[in-house]
């Protein structure tokens, strides 16, 4: 048999070998596709199937607009002028080229030695699904699960049957000061079909530096709260990726899960003390915030205590 590849929505003509070019013709077309459950023999007189597969006067079969459901096998059996039976057999596959792939949510820069999301490559409207590949400086990037990580997702449109592919690239650059170029390409995997490429993105890789600052914000401002009130301490760090944050009270670590927010509900005198947060970043050591003092007292009977953060409500470590 012969393999035929047809573009979705385009017409396709399959010739019936051996069939006389004009009637009278002795021929039979049958098909087994997504529109049938077994072999369907087409009536030479035409009928309701003509909208999807029609026998032409010369004996060829016309598919006016091929669809996904037209994938399958088409066979013609004809008797030629000399009375010999001639068979034609076609295996039809369909395809649809998607729109140009795009890198969405691209990173603005990368940090060496830590995982960075480069961006997400998206291709919409392909059939069959095809594949997305990432390239670094023009060379194919092979995911290793460590320095190069690719997360893929394939979705099929419920009505059109066409595919949307998404590929998210995460890398750990080894050193700063470089300017790698990333691109993504879509391939249908069909012969004679060139891949579709995204516009490349060039990113700067910077060395991981210490976080620019660590701030401890306290609510209510001044750290003075009435008994039964609530205190919220927030550790604000500008580092990427966000570090783990632990809490210290009066010099001792608090046995709590790491969190950038510490909530003290229904405070009592036992909650009084000096609090600070410690941020632990993978690329450099722990960093501690300036302390804040929490006082539990009836409102208005005292001013800010010594060592509190005063009116501003925050302490900053340069």
């Amino acid at each position: 048999g012969q393999n035929i590849t047809a573009r979705i929505g385009e017409p396709l003509v399959l010739s019936c070998k051996g069939a006389p070019k004009k009637p009278p013709q002795q021929l039979e077309w049958k098909l087994n596709t997504g529109r049938t459950e077994a072999w369907k023999v087409l009536s030479p007189q035409g009928g309701p199937w003509d909208s999807v597969a029609r026998i032409l006067p010369n004996g060829s079969l016309l598919l006016p607009a091929t669809g996904i459901v037209d994938e399958g096998t088409f066979r013609c059996r004809a008797t030629n002028r000399r009375g010999k039976e001639v068979k034609s057999n076609y295996r039809v596959r369909v395809y649809q080229i998607p729109g140009k792939p795009e890198i969405v949510d691209p990173a603005s820069e990368l940090t060496a030695s830590v995982p960075n999301k480069v961006g997400t490559c998206v291709s919409e409207g392909s059939y069959p699904a095809g594949t997305l590949s990432w390239h670094l400086d023009g060379k194919l990037l092979i995911p290793d699960g460590k320095e190069t990580l690719v997360k893929e997702e394939t979705r099929r449109h419920p009505e059109t049957g066409l595919f949307t592919l998404r590929s998210e690239l995460t890398v750990i650059p080894t050193q700063g000061g470089t300017h790698p170029t990333f691109s993504c390409s879509f391939s249908l995997g069909l012969p004679r079909r060139r891949p579709l490429n995204t516009a490349p993105i060039q990113l700067r890789v910077r060395e991981p530096g210490p976080p620019e600052g660590i701030q401890l914000l306290v609510e209510p401002e001044g750290g003075i709260v009435a008994p039964g009130g609530t205190v919220t301490l927030t550790c604000a760090i500008s580092a990427q990726p966000p570090p783990q944050v632990h809490w210290i009270k009066d010099g001792a670590p608090l046995p709590l899960a790491p969190s950038p927010v510490l909530l003290l509900p229904e405070v009592g005198h036992e909650d009084e003390g000096t609090y600070s947060c410690v941020a632990t970043h993978p690329s450099h050591g722990p960093q501690e915030s300036p302390p804040v003092s929490i006082r539990v007292t009836e409102t208005g009977d005292e001013g800010p205590a010594e060592g509190s953060v005063g009116e501003s409500g925050l302490g900053t470590l340069a």
Epitope: R35, T36, E37, A38, K40, S43, Q45, G46, G47, P48, W49, D50, S51, V52, R54
Partner: antibody, heavy 119, light 107 residues
């Protein structure tokens, strides 16, 4: 909203002719096959004719072949049925319906127009 | 030509009853069968397309099923507005063929 409105029915003598029309709206007319179906008084439904979306191919049952002609004007969103050599047994309500191929079957129908063949 | 043998030709039922109407095709017609409802003096209304699919705006008490060349329309709980005549149609081959109809009457 898909709408099909038939007209042109009436009383005609045996051997006479009549032309039915169907005005279509609410959909892209030239994307669909169109079909005429009839129903004799107190009887079931009977297929009369179908035409493909371009108007190039027409289909009839033996009972009306060579007497009836289905046609369409895609520019006017209109379907027609020319009925010649009418017989008493052609008396029926004639419905215009969208479809007639395997993609649609028959989905939307007009309200029908009555054709009476009697002397 | 394909014959569509519809049964029963009529039935009496009460509101709330489960009603089943069958069409048998004389040869394989695949999934290419529609079901219609027709009320006196009105045009047919499509209920089911391609044997099993519920048409837009049709209540979910209507369903279609297929076993080989046997096609079934089921009304799970008959409502007062369902008393009408029902037809099947095969559209796999010409001539397009309708079943003879089933008149559903109030018991």
């Amino acid at each position: 909203e898909v709408q099909l409105v038939e007209s042109g029915g009436g009383l005609v003598q045996p051997g006479g002719s009549l032309r039915l029309s169907c005005a279509a709206s609410g959909f892209t007319f030239n994307n669909y096959w169109m079909t005429w179906v009839r129903q004799a008084p107190g009887k079931g439904l009977e297929w009369v004719a179908s035409i493909d979306n371009s108007g190039d191919n027409t289909y009839y049952p033996d009972s009306v072949k060579d007497r009836f002609t289905i046609s369409r004007d895609n520019a006017k969103n209109s379907l027609y049925l020319q009925m010649n050599s009418l017989r008493a047994e052609d008396t029926a309500v004639y419905y215009c319906a969208r479809g007639g191929d395997i993609l649609v079957g028959l989905d939307y129908w007009g309200q029908g127009t009555l054709v009476t063949v009697s002397s | 030509d394909i014959q569509m043998t519809q049964s029963p030709s009529s039935l009496s039922a009460s509101v709330g009853d489960r009603v089943t109407i069958t069409c048998r095709a004389s040869q394989d017609v695949g999934i290419y069968v529609n079901w219609f409802q027709q009320k006196p003096g009105k045009a047919p209304r499509r209920l089911i397309y391609r044997a099993t699919n519920l048409a837009d705006g049709v209540p979910s008490r209507f369903s279609g099923s297929r076993s080989g060349t046997d096609f079934t329309l089921t009304i799970s709980s008959l409502q007062p507005e369902d008393f009408a005549t029902y037809y099947c149609l095969e559209f796999d081959e010409h001539p397009l063929t309708f079943g003879g109809g089933t008149k559903v009457e109030i018991k």
